[in-house]
């Protein structure tokens, strides 16, 4: 069951959406508590993903998702990535929170999670030049997986931004 | 149960189109992830992956062969097919189909779980 | 194409003793997170059968003493202890991109 426009539960912060789809969570009898995702959000787990379809260079992806109180999406896990990827369309290629400001091949996520190399999902030689410093996930029909590709990040792309559920 | 049958003419000439049927049972070709693979092995050596056909029919070829390859499908009656043209002595072999689970999405799969007993093929004058 | 390189060609193995088989990738079978490695087991009249799937998966139904290892590059097939029944030809198999290649094959033999 969603509830939405329960924005009055929660006086204590102005929030920039003005929609939330809820669901009730089981707790304590004496307790009301919802976990809520932005209208027209993704719900995955304890966060919420929006799949922007405008396109925007890497800098400017993230600062539209900090204007919705997010951020680029950062990979945890398998099961969370092949969520996303059911989400995504084949033909277009989206920013993650993932690049490598320097050149020097030291990938950071946006969050600060450590870049761990054994938890990558790099395509086939990739990623492949220095001055590629940003990660977009994409699908390659050959062998037909979605994965991570370097690339320029001036270049515009769609993007995926990513938050915390609010809980009312 | 998952199985799979190849069958063929047996015997023909150089010269000639190879048609193959690989008949299944036990898992559906529309369903997302799935896939069928001709793969060909020649008396005593070893094997050879010739084509493979997805769920969406999207297909993949040995480029090797791929001007002489078709590999298409029919889900209703699920079966796969592969057309060899102007075969040679040198495509005497035994067939196998082999299903492929490749799940969509992911980043797993891609390897052949369960093969036919295959068709064995004499190209002969 | 990835060209995958098998040694030995084929070799003897005393009942109960450990066989190691080798196969060489001539580039990374690395992506995505796995490496995109199989291993088959194929003996006379029969078709192949998984045992060994992305480098070191067991396949259902595999014997334990069947396992493997290795990343990249170089991946190893390991039966320990043999046993009679293993005496077969083992072959690798990458799909990390098309086209999709096997190794030449191992034939192992019984003493």
């Known amino acids: 069951q969603k509830y939405s426009q329960l924005l009055e539960k929660k006086t204590t912060k102005e929030l920039v959406h003005t929609t939330l789809e809820c669901v009730k969570k089981n707790m304590p009898v004496e307790e009301t508590a919802w976990s809520c995702c932005p209208k027209n959000w993704k719900s995955f787990s304890s966060n919420c993903y929006f799949i922007s379809t405008e396109s925007a260079s890497w800098q400017d992806s993230e600062k539209d998702c900090a204007r919705m109180e997010a951020h680029l999406l950062v990979i945890n896990t398998q099961e969370e990535q092949d969520f996303i990827f059911q989400n995504l369309q084949e033909e277009s290629a989206y920013f993650v929170g993932l690049s490598d400001p320097e050149g020097q091949r030291h990938w950071q996520w946006v969050d600060q999670t450590p870049y761990n190399e054994s938890s990558t999902f790099w395509h086939p030689r990739e990623p492949s030049d220095p001055n590629e410093r940003c990660v977009v996930l994409n699908f390659r029909k050959s062998p037909k997986r979605w994965g991570w590709n370097d690339v320029n990040c001036l270049g515009p792309q769609r993007s995926v931004c990513e938050m915390m559920k609010i809980h009312l | 149960q998952v199985t799979l049958k190849e069958s063929g003419p047996g015997i023909l000439q150089p010269s000639q189109t190879l048609s193959l049927t690989c008949s299944f049972s036990?898992?559906?070709?529309?369903?997302?992830?799935?896939?069928v693979s001709w793969i060909r092995q020649p008396s005593g050596k070893g094997l050879e992956w010739l084509a493979h056909?997805?769920?969406?029919?999207?297909?993949r070829y040995n480029p090797s062969l791929k001007s002489r390859l078709t590999i298409f499908k029919d889900p209703s009656s699920n079966q796969v097919f592969l057309r060899i043209t102007s075969v040679d002595t040198a495509d005497t072999a035994t067939y196998y189909c082999?299903?492929?689970?490749?799940?969509?999405?992911?980043?797993?799969?891609?390897?052949?779980?369960?093969w036919g007993a295959g068709t064995t093929v004499t190209v002969s004058s | 194409n990835i060209v995958l390189t098998q040694s030995p060609t084929s070799f003897t193995v005393s009942l109960g003793q450990r066989a190691t088989i080798s196969c060489r990738a001539s580039?990374?079978?690395?992506?995505?997170?796995?490496?995109?490695m199989h291993w088959y087991q194929q003996k006379p009249g029969q078709p192949p059968k998984l045992l060994i799937y992305?480098?070191?998966n067991v396949e259902s139904g595999v014997p334990a003493r069947f396992s493997g290892s290795g990343s990249r590059t170089d991946f190893t097939l390991t039966i320990d202890p043999v046993e009679a029944d293993d005496a077969a030809t083992y072959y690798c198999?990458?799909?990390?991109?098309?086209?999709?290649?096997f190794g030449g094959g191992t034939k192992l033999e019984i003493k």
């Open positions: 082999a299903r492929n689970s490749h799940y969509y999405g992911s980043t797993y799969g891609g390897y052949f779980d369960v």
């Open positions: 036990g898992f559906s070709l529309s369903t997302s992830g799935m896939g």
């Open positions: 056909i997805y769920w969406d029919d999207d297909k």
């Open positions: 580039e990374s079978v690395h992506s995505y997170g796995n490496s995109f």
């Open positions: 992305l480098a070191s």
């Open positions: 198999q990458q799909n990390s991109e098309d086209p999709w290649t």
